[in-house]
Structure formats: structure tokens, C-alpha cells
Interface confidence: medium
């Protein structure tokens, strides 16, 4: 997998007049790094991970950029014709890639009330758009007001791609997120389901990259998808991962049932814990 | 292609001790038990027990569980079953066996006949 | 321990005939759990089918398997020579694991 820079920012109006607040969300390698809120605008790192990434410094140079940027899309908004009333939001996605044959890739993209409508190659300069009119009305109006914007569009989109890219390079280069494998922790938990039923779960947390294969198996051979529910891979908050599979089972029957993990090539597998019932909850 | 080759014929005494291997080859050997089964001459299929190779867990059918003891050796990928204190009703083919799914047998040894006379 | 019972215990049909084998069970199993194996003089048994129904790789479509709760069955639509064998059920439900004593099917 590629490292990963991507800038989610998120501007609103309300019955056409923009909002002075904005919200901006940074994702490294996938996971939640920086949060700009809505009001004022201060670069928070998300968990202890993001914080040894940037170091023992002041975060003023993204508080600058994020706000820069929100500005920018506030602007972008104010110029997007024919608004309805109500609440209305423009949504701005950039993602700068740098993957391991050292090659780059850079996109925007943006999204009116949740809805894709225009996107940009900001290598290749190449904007795309879906087929629908509402939206291609929409890209027009951004388009142009992006081009009028100014003669330094050319410049400012380079610098757009190439400003992501020295940041990602700069993050990688704390080493906290060079391409790493943070193997799993799995815990093995029982719960009461209904008479003469357990659910057995299988967590694994604490994992990176994200790429996981948790399963139930009944005497050496896995369950069959029906049978087992299963949690999303979800962010910890650490720079990793977490996620989680459940089975139902009969009582008396745990000894043949474990909890299969496969992650970054290695694999283990691990037993029902034996004894009274931990955890008085059903998943199910 | 899967295969699981099991060893030769043996001819044992009462109250002798007997070892039957069986070497799997064509998957992973860590990803499925290995399952025992014996059959008495003429008789059903009777299942012993079976061995999760990757922890070791071994599962017996209790009828058994004094006399057998079932064993892995991942190098080689090659399970054993050794039956201890033969008796004359010991006699039999031992089949090994990899677990499928939902817990049948999908593959099956060629068989070992053990035979327990005085 | 889940018993299985399997009739009839012989059964003599000619080539071309249709073969009907029961399996019954002691207690209730889930119909994922329950398989057929067919069995040939000085052979290894094969799997036929698993989870009540499903053909294991390799068995023609003349065989099929039914059934639920604690009753199964295992058909052949039309005897073929190479069908003539013993055939056995199996429940992996619940330990310990257990077959059926047999059904053997010889030519008339």
C-alpha cells in the first residue's frame, strides 16, 4: 500500500449565506492525524501517534494551511449559484499518494450535499465529472470560479499537489509511520446468548496495516459467512487498528471452536477461553 | 493435490503399544485437524479423536481417552496415533483424515491395518 | 451421544433402479452438520455430500441428499455399477463425533 496524505474539509451555508465555521479532518496512511473544529480553527493531533509524528512542536504551520484552505472553500461556496434554502455543504477531498516505487499520484475532489460532482488530477491537471446534469452544472460554476480565481491557478494547483506531498514526505520522515507491520493483539471472550447458547467473540486490536482476516473455526475448518457477524475495521485512535468477529455456539461445545487470525503473513490461532461466562451481553 | 500417505501393516501383541503416522502433503498442514477413524473388520466407521496441529489442541472421543494419544509434528507435516495396551478388539484399519467443512472428513489416508493377536 | 441409524441395512437393486437411504438421528441436528460417505470394498471412504445436500468435488449429479431435524436422506436417481458400495452418514454437530452403522447397496 501507498503512504497516504488525505485533507477532508468541509465548509456549510445556510439559505445561501456561508457559514464563518469550518471543519477539516487530515488522514495519514488511513488514519486520523489532524483535526481542524469548526470555530476556531487550532490543529489538534489525534491520539499519541499523530503527536510523536509532528514532534515537540507547535502545530502553526497546518493551523495556517487548514485554515487557508477552509477560507478558500468558503469562497468556493459563495460562489456556487442557484443555492436552495435550507442547510447546504461543499466538501473538498485531497489525497497525495507517494507509493513504493517512489511514484506520486495527487487528487481533489468535491462534493455538494454529500454528492460527488467534480474531481481534478492534480498531476495531470485533468478534471473529471459525473454524467448528471445537476452536477455538471455544479462543476461548471466551480470550474470557472477556480480558473477566474486567478492567473495563479497554475501555480496554486502545482503548489496544491506539491505542498501535499512535501508534508507527507515530512511526516514520513519521523519515522513513527514508515511502512511498519504492528502485529495483533486477539482476546477470546464468551457471553451469554440464550438458553444453552454462548456467543463467543474474537477481537484483534492494536494492528497495523489494516489489511486483517479474523474468523471462526469449527474443528480446524472455518465457519461459514452466515454464521459469524463481523465488526468493521475501525481507526483506535493509536495509529492502529482494531476489529472484531462473533459466533453463536452451544454450551459444552467451546473446546472445538477457535478463533482464526491471519495478518501480515503470520497467522495464530486462538482457543475459547474454558469456564463460567465472563461478559452477560449478546452481539446478537 | 491433496494426499495423506499413512504407514504400513503392523502386527502387535496384546498389551503392546502400536504408532501410526500420517504424512499430509498438496495444503497447509496448520489449517485443518487431522482426524482419526477406525474400522473393525466388517463393522462401521468409528471416530478416535483429531488434532488442531497449529496449538496442539488435541480433541478425544472419550471412549478412547485412556488408551490413545494423538500427536503433530508440523515440520514434517505428519500426525501420529498410538494406541497403547492392545487388545484382540483393537483390531482394525486406523484411517487419518482432514477435517472439511462443518466437520466431515474430505480427505482420507489409504488406511493402516492393525492387527492384535497372541 | 447422537445416534444414527441408517436403513435399510442392505438393500438389493438392479442397475438403473432408484436407491433411497435413511439416515435417522437420535436428537435433533442441524442440517449443515450432516454428511454422506460412500464406501468401496478395500477402499478409503469419499466424501459424497456435505451439509445435507451439497455434492462433494467429483460425485455425479445422480446423487442428492434432503432432509432436516433429525431425519436425512441420501437418493441415487439410477444405479450405476460403480454406485454398488456401502454408504455411511455422519453428524459433526456435537462431540462426539458419529457416523451410521451403514447401508450397503448390492446388486440383485
Known amino acids: 500500500e501507498p503512504h497516504s496524505l488525505r485533507y477532508n474539509l468541509t465548509v456549510l451555508s445556510w439559505d445561501g449565506s456561508v457559514q464563518s465555521g469550518f471543519l477539516t479532518e487530515v488522514h495519514l496512511d488511513g488514519q486520523p492525524f489532524l483535526r481542524c473544529d469548526r470555530q476556531k480553527c487550532r490543529a489538534k493531533p489525534q491520539g499519541q501517534w499523530a503527536e510523536d509524528v509532528l514532534g515537540n512542536k507547535t502545530w502553526d504551520r497546518e493551523t495556517r494551511d487548514l485554515t487557508g484552505n477552509g477560507k478558500d472553500l468558503r469562497m468556493t461556496l459563495a460562489h456556487i449559484k442557484d443555492q436552495k434554502e435550507g442547510l447546504h455543504s461543499l466538501q473538498e477531498i485531497r489525497v497525495c499518494e507517494i507509493h513504493e516505487d517512489n511514484s506520486t499520484r495527487s487528487s481533489q475532489h468535491f462534493y455538494y450535499d454529500g454528492e460527488l460532482f467534480l474531481s481534478q488530477n492534480l498531476e495531470t491537471k485533468e478534471w473529471t465529472m459525473p454524467q448528471s446534469s445537476r452536477a455538471q452544472t455544479l462543476a461548471m460554476n466551480v470550474r470557472n470560479f477556480l480558473k477566474e480565481d486567478a492567473m495563479k491557478t497554475k501555480t496554486h494547483y502545482h503548489a496544491m499537489h506539491a505542498d501535499c506531498l512535501q508534508e507527507l514526505r515530512r511526516y514520513l520522515k519521523s519515522g513513527v509511520v514508515l511502512r511498519r507491520t504492528v502485529p495483533p493483539m486477539v482476546n477470546v471472550t464468551r457471553s451469554e446468548a440464550s438458553e444453552g447458547n454462548i456467543t463467543v467473540t474474537c477481537r484483534a486490536s492494536g494492528f497495523y496495516p489494516w489489511n486483517i482476516t479474523l474468523s471462526w473455526r469449527q474443528d480446524g475448518v472455518s465457519l461459514s459467512h452466515d454464521t459469524q457477524q463481523w465488526g468493521d475495521v475501525l481507526p483506535d485512535g493509536n495509529g492502529t487498528y482494531q476489529t472484531w468477529v462473533a459466533t453463536r455456539i452451544c454450551q459444552g461445545e467451546e473446546q472445538r471452536f477457535t478463533c482464526y487470525m491471519e495478518h501480515s503473513g503470520n497467522h495464530s490461532t486462538h482457543p475459547v477461553p474454558s469456564g463460567k461466562v465472563l461478559v452477560l451481553q449478546s452481539h446478537w | 493435490e491433496v494426499q495423506l500417505v499413512q504407514s504400513g501393516a503392523e502386527v502387535k501383541k496384546p498389551g503392546a503399544s502400536v504408532k501410526v503416522s500420517c504424512k499430509a502433503s498438496g495444503y497447509a498442514f496448520t489449517s485443518n485437524n487431522i482426524y482419526w477413524v477406525r474400522q473393525a473388520p466388517g463393522q462401521g466407521l468409528e471416530w478416535i479423536g483429531y488434532i488442531d496441529p497449529y496449538i496442539g489442541r488435541i480433541i478425544y472421543n472419550q471412549q478412547f481417552k485412556d488408551r490413545v494419544t494423538i500427536t503433530a509434528d508440523t515440520s514434517t507435516s505428519t500426525a501420529y496415533l498410538e494406541l497403547s495396551s492392545l487388545r484382540s478388539e483393537d483390531t482394525a484399519v486406523y484411517y487419518c483424515?482432514?477435517?472439511?467443512?462443518?466437520?466431515?472428513?474430505?480427505?482420507w489416508g489409504q488406511g493402516t491395518l492393525v492387527t492384535v493377536s497372541s | 451421544e447422537i445416534v444414527l441409524t441408517q436403513s435399510p441395512a442392505t438393500l438389493s437393486l438392479s442397475p438403473g433402479e432408484r436407491a433411497t437411504l435413511s439416515c435417522s438421528a437420535s436428537s435433533s441436528i442441524s442440517s449443515n452438520y450432516l454428511h454422506w460417505y460412500q464406501q468401496k470394498p478395500g477402499q478409503s471412504p469419499r466424501l459424497l455430500i456435505y451439509?445435507?445436500?451439497n455434492l462433494a468435488s467429483g460425485v455425479p449429479a445422480r446423487f442428492s441428499g434432503s432432509g432436516s431435524g433429525t431425519d436425512y436422506t441420501l437418493t441415487i436417481s439410477s444405479l450405476e455399477p460403480e454406485d454398488f458400495a456401502v454408504y455411511y452418514c455422519q453428524q459433526g454437530g456435537s462431540l462426539p463425533l458419529t457416523f451410521g452403522q451403514g447401508t450397503k447397496v448390492e446388486i440383485k
Open positions: 451439509r445435507t445436500s
Open positions: 483424515s482432514r477435517s472439511g467443512e462443518r466437520s466431515n472428513f474430505d480427505y
